[in-house]
Interface confidence: low
Amino acid sequence: GSERTCCPVNWVEHERSCYWFSRSGKAWADADNYCRLEDAHLVVVTSWEEQKFVQHHIGPVNTWMGLHDQNGPWKWVDGTDYETGFKNWRPEQPDDWYGHGLGGGEDCAHFTDDGRWNDDVCQRPYRWVCETELDKASQEPPLL
């Protein structure tokens, strides 16, 4: 495939990445799959500057990001190291709360209304943000 030189239509370019902001809600798994179908991934926040950019675009709305601990440790969907990376959790979060009565704990991270992060039940249908890097090769469809 060839290297992307500009963002797809309806995507926003910022610091060599392209971002797409949903206006509907999906469960985390569906949002994750949506981004993958777009040859992208749920947003991975690597700096305070990127946090502010995303926060500005989503407003005070619960919004999924590409961070989860469904297999144990917290992981970013693109493999970015969680332990050494940027974090912006709300106080006392993540708490893997079981008291919601919905079964299980809380395994997926989202931006809250103030932009800080919370872990929540992955089935909640929140908005989401997809991200893809301009410097990565795009997937050309195979010739049939």
Partner: antibody, heavy 116, light 113 residues
């Protein structure tokens, strides 16, 4: 024990409106997502709409989008479905259901008949 | 939308015999990150609302007799009644809750032969 009781069904003319209610008890209503599901006479189940625990997120099936509105009042432990521009094909038993890994509790349903 | 299909449309089973119902989804309902299939099975008896039997494709809801079991992964699923009882006469539905809108199969009617 968990109980869901629907009300508000009845006979309505095409183009008319109805508001269904679902009274919940026996669980912490504000912790749960809720759905409306319907079943036309002699037919299968059709999932219609879904509302988050706080009421901030809603979703509709295409068949009712723009005509039906789901809402909730957590202080009253109640779920609602406002149905406008009703059509003959909306005739069905309407169920409210507590939503999680599937719908684990259902009401007994309320019958809506749309006919002139 | 994910389309759910079921087979057969109906079946008649002798008391004590095994009943098998198949459900197929138009796309996978398996989420690889947690290895769970977002599929449920319901039983609906005449004049009653549906009753949740199985969730996560194979986990029995509390209070459901162990003669009911669910299996399968991805797009192909099965509900099995290991020993048919008179009270099992009902219509059985599968439902995916992986992708909004959640969708049901058309149902399989199970009777006593």
């Amino acid at each position: 024990q968990v109980q869901l009781v629907e009300s508000g069904g009845g006979l309505v003319k095409p183009g008319g409106s109805l508001r269904l209610s679902c009274a919940a008890s026996g669980f912490t209503f504000s912790d749960y997502y809720m759905s409306w599901i319907r079943q036309a006479p002699g037919k299968g189940l059709e999932w219609l709409s879904y509302i988050s625990s706080s009421g901030t997120t809603v979703f509709y099936a295409d068949s009712v989008k723009g005509r039906f509105t789901i809402s909730r009042d957590n202080a009253k432990n109640s779920l609602y479905l406002q149905m406008n521009s009703l059509r003959a094909e909306d005739t069905a038993v309407y169920y409210c259901a507590r939503e999680w890994v599937g719908a684990d509790y259902w009401g007994q349903g309320t019958l809506v008949t749309v006919s002139s | 939308d994910i389309v759910m299909t079921q087979s057969p449309d109906s079946l008649a089973v002798s008391l004590g015999e095994r009943a098998t119902i198949n459900c197929k989804s138009s796309q996978s309902v398996l989420f690889n990150s947690n290895n769970k299939n977002y599929l449920a099975w319901y039983q609906q008896k005449p004049g009653q609302p549906p009753n949740l039997l199985i969730y996560w494709a194979s986990t029995r809801e509390s209070g459901v007799p162990d003669r009911f079991s669910g299996s399968g992964s991805g797009t192909d699923f099965t509900l099995t009644i290991s020993s048919m009882q008179a009270e099992d006469v009902a219509v059985y539905y599968c439902q995916q809750y992986c992708s909004l809108p959640f969708t049901f199969g058309p149902g399989t009617k199970v009777d006593i032969r």
